[in-house]
């Protein structure tokens, strides 16, 4: 009888399945940053390393009792969800721990920072295989901790962090709004956000992804051979911190950005109830839950993509959002969303040597968000070419005009403030194959890419009755890398990329005035890998 | 992600009054304090200094020491905890929040952030 | 090879007192923690408490925590089991075992059968 | 504080048979469960530890399987020796070993 977490997370064919890796050497090394653990417990005897290290602040209150059970029952229970021989992810993965969290679960951000410190150097002194952290700890926003993730990530470093239980917005706490780590939210076994108490998982844009977090079986401190259930973020980051210990063993050459995107590719999808979510944070927040993917020799040279989220821009009238890539990805295209739907559209801008993506307010907006389609495409060679506005009631034309560059994505930025003046942007499929064309004062971005066997098309979708949103998919074996939406006369909220749905939001006012001349309609730029061919455009 | 998000960052860029010493006058402090939106969790009195990214090992030091000078001429003891020199430049400071105008003057800072907690998920 | 020895059974009056000892041999004394154990007649095997030899750490089922006492004497290999304010439902054949905490009881005493009766 | 439950409490079987008897726990206790057999007049002996794995000297007839909470001890065939009352044991924090009630094995 397997618990539910370990069913969920790894796949049938995957169950008795050892992961090793190919030349059997490389040993995946899992840091867990947390209380004490009780290293004698048959669940990780044998396979944890209990380093000297311990940081961590008194604990409160002058009658408190220490009681080396209760000290080591939090860590204890996540190195059992890691690599317990019975309950674990990545049954047999090697673990140090680092003490960072008292016996009342409180640590400090110094604390968690040496010990960050401690990991680097211990991998300066001593480098070995892949290694993998886990922070299953939140503290308030710290610039310094995101900054010293960014630092460790860099040097070849994951980092899997809790995304708090405070049923809040991630971003707002640390080391989870750290680009550079992965960020984990918990469900239980409906799939659905774990409720702790009055609060419960943290969610939005920060959030990377989902796993189980609620009466997760593990390692119990009371006794060498005995388990307990414990929910939260940090079982959920702990089943991540498994699943990337077995995909690094396996595969010891995957770097950050592959396992993430592999991540989110292979998760289960839209199984969360996005209800439980505050209602701003809903399109924000990945309906994804974590599963063991399979090997890159078992799928090929897919294309990979994600969504990035830019922080809310703001409501003043010339306030920008800015969406960034990881330093690997390709930005394959930009646009962005208001709820209001008063936004002067997107484009891409190099800034330090790193293209982002760039939304901008309109005079009376709430604030708008720029929407990043990052990529992985290997031997990748992007560009952007922009037109200026053109003269009123004249099209505006992009197209990729380099030998074998095919267009990934497509951003409009409007010069004037006034909505009323302009009519939206559009795209032409089948009259300008592979081309942005814009419309009375938008600056136009086409993004081109040239990479080994990239072919992309063009899918719209249109509907002209009342509709809050119109959708396109890209068919199976296509990965969306671009999303734009085309209106008649209304007013749009924006477009948006949902793993491989392009979604083109309406503004509600808009719907009941709108005559079934005035389609609105959603673009989705399909592009997909086949390494054996050339770059072309589908028509 | 990396925006600040509900922070505290305040500026005590305050010109130096009690110190006639050429070097402190002639640094005007760009450098910001920051420090965590929940009050509860803060930890007063602990403080990262965070150093510019190129900064090097000896300049760190030289910076500790710096500050434990200048603190003592008013009259105040303060604790180097700790130094980073791996993962980025900097040093871990017990001391009177009254020095923290001193401290964002001083050369290489970038900023400083007040000690909090975090806790078990 | 290993081999655990008990001593000490006999009748005993209720009300009564009685220590059974377990003499340990064929292995590193204080590496494994001594388990006793006991089972009334026709009844099913019921822990007592324990003893980790290389500590004097102990631990009772709490059933037992007023009546049993168990302690080591390391020169001699040997552990014991303090057994007071005895009763006719203490009568029962009391066994040694030993084990690594969290590990199978792999090595067992051949029992000593304590009747308590007036 | 962990229940375990052995079926059935008697088994009458003929030499030459096949013996299953089950033990569930009322929580997940994982592989770490232990069978042993006693016999008339005898101490307890370990028959398999971590539910599937043999002790030392224990014929091949004798074999464990289970994990989480329902665990399954075989005997494939039944030798004139192997009829006897087998156990089931865990640990828990209080206390800290428990025992199944036992499954008598008779020939029927």
């Known amino acids: 009888s397997i618990p539910w977490n370990l069913e969920r997370i790894i796949p049938a064919w995957h169950q008795t399945e050892e992961d090793r890796s190919p030349d059997g050497s490389s040993q995946v090394e899992v840091y867990l940053l947390d209380t004490s653990i009780q290293g004698a417990h048959r669940e990780i005897e044998g396979r944890v390393t209990i380093t000297d290290f311990n940081s961590v602040p008194e604990e409160d209150g002058t009658r408190f009792h220490r009681q080396a059970s209760k000290c080591d029952s939090h860590g204890t229970h996540l190195a059992g969800v890691v690599s317990g021989r019975d309950a674990g992810v990545a049954k047999g993965t090697s673990l140090h721990s680092l003490r960072v969290l008292n016996c009342q679960g409180k640590g400090t951000v110094s604390g968690t920072l040496i010990g960050l410190e401690f990991i680097r150097k211990s991998q300066l002194i001593q480098p070995s295989g892949p290694l993998v952290v886990l922070l299953p700890l939140a503290g308030g926003y710290s610039r310094i901790l995101n900054a010293a993730c960014r630092h460790l990530a860099r040097t070849g470093v994951v980092l899997v962090a809790a995304a708090g239980n405070f049923r809040d917005d991630a971003c707002l706490y640390s080391p989870a709004s750290a680009p550079e780590v992965i960020t984990v939210g918990a469900t239980n076994a409906q799939d659905q956000p774990v409720t702790l108490g009055t609060l419960g998982t943290n969610f939005g844009r920060c959030v990377d992804l989902f796993a189980p977090g609620k009466d997760i079986i593990g390692a119990s401190s009371d006794c060498s051979t005995c388990f307990m259930s414990q929910s939260g973020t940090s079982q959920a980051a702990a089943h991540v911190a498994g699943i990337v210990a077995r995909m690094l063993s396996r595969e010891p050459t995957l770097t950050l950005a592959e396992l993430r995107q592999r991540l989110i590719h292979f998760s289960t999808k839209d199984v969360i109830n996005m209800a439980w979510f505050p209602e701003d944070q809903q399109v924000l927040t990945p309906n994804l839950v974590a599963t063991l993917p399979p090997s890159t020799h078992e799928t090929g040279g897919q294309l990979l993509c994600r969504t990035v989220w830019s922080a809310h821009s703001g409501p003043t009238r010339t306030a920008t959002a800015t969406a960034r890539c990881a330093p690997e990805e390709e930005l394959l295209s930009c646009s962005s969303f208001s709820r209001s739907g008063r936004r002067r559209g997107d484009w891409i801008e190099a800034i330090g040597g790193q293209q982002v993506c760039k939304a901008l307010n309109a005079f009376g907006g709430e604030g708008v968000y720029a929407v990043a389609r990052c990529c992985l495409v290997p031997r990748a060679n992007c560009s952007i070419h922009n037109t200026p506005a053109a003269r009123a009631g004249l099209e505006t034309h992009v197209h990729c005009h380099q030998k074998d560059h095919v267009l990934t994505g497509c951003s409009f930025h409007w010069e004037v403030e006034d909505l009323s003046v302009r009519r939206q942007p559009a795209l032409r499929s089948r009259r300008q194959p592979g081309q942005c064309v814009g419309h009375q004062a938008a600056s136009v971005y086409a993004s081109c890419c040239h990479a080994p066997g990239l072919e992309c098309k063009i899918k719209e979708h249109g509907i002209s009755g009342p509709s809050e949103q119109v959708t396109v998919a890209c068919e199976a074996g296509w990965t969306l890398t671009g999303c734009n939406v085309l209106p008649g006369a209304s007013l749009t909220l924006g477009a948006y990329s949902v793993d491989n749905l392009c979604v083109a939001r309406v503004h509600d006012t808009a719907r009941a005035d709108r005559t079934s001349g005035e389609a609105t309609v959603a673009a989705a730029i399909c592009c997909r890998s086949r390494p054996s061919a050339k770059a072309s455009w589908v028509q | 992600q990396d925006e600040d998000g509900d922070y505290e960052e305040l500026m005590l860029a305050l010109p130096s009054q009690e110190d006639g010493l050429a070097d402190e006058a002639a640094h005007v402090a760009t450098a910001t304090f920051r420090r965590c939106s929940k009050e509860a969790w803060r930890l007063p009195g602990t403080y990262i200094v965070v150093l510019m990214e190129e900064t090097q090992r000896l300049q760190i030091e030289q910076t500790a020491h710096r500050l434990q000078t200048r603190a003592a001429r008013r009259g105040y003891v303060i604790k180097v905890l700790h130094i980073f020199y791996d993962l980025f430049p900097g040093f871990l400071v017990k001391m009177s929040s009254d020095l923290l105008g001193l401290a964002l003057k001083l050369p290489h800072v970038e900023y400083i952030e007040e000690d909090s907690f975090v806790f078990a998920q | 090879q290993v081999q655990l020895l008990e001593s000490g059974g006999g009748l005993v009056q209720p009300g009564g007192s009685l220590r059974l000892s377990c003499k340990a041999s064929?292995?590193?004394?204080?590496?494994?923690?001594i388990y006793w154990v006991r089972q009334a007649p026709g009844k099913g095997l019921e822990w007592i408490g324990w003893i980790d030899p290389g500590n004097g750490g102990t631990r009772y089922n709490q059933k037992f925590q007023s009546k049993a006492t168990i302690s080591r004497d390391n020169s001699k290999n040997t552990l014991y089991l303090q057994m007071n304010s005895l009763r006719a439902e203490d009568t029962a054949v009391y066994y040694c075992a030993r084990a690594r905490v969290g590990y199978s009881l792999d090595y067992w005493g051949q029992g000593t059968l304590v009747t308590v009766s007036s | 504080e962990i229940v375990l439950t052995q079926s059935p409490a008697t088994l009458s079987l003929s030499p030459g048979e096949r013996a299953t008897i089950t033990c569930r726990a009322s929580q997940y206790v994982g592989s770490y469960l232990n069978w042993y057999q006693q016999k008339p007049g005898q101490a307890p002996r370990l028959l398999i530890y971590?539910?599937?794995n043999r002790a030392t000297g224990i014929p091949a007839r004798f074999s464990g399987s289970g994990s989480g909470t329902d665990f399954t001890l075989t005997i494939s065939s039944l030798e004139p020796e192997d009829f006897a009352v087998y156990y089931c044991q865990v640990w828990d924090s209080s206390p800290p070993v428990v025992f199944g009630g036992g499954t008598k094995v008779e020939i029927k």
């Open positions: 971590d539910a599937s």
């Open positions: 064929g292995y590193t004394f204080s590496s494994y923690s």
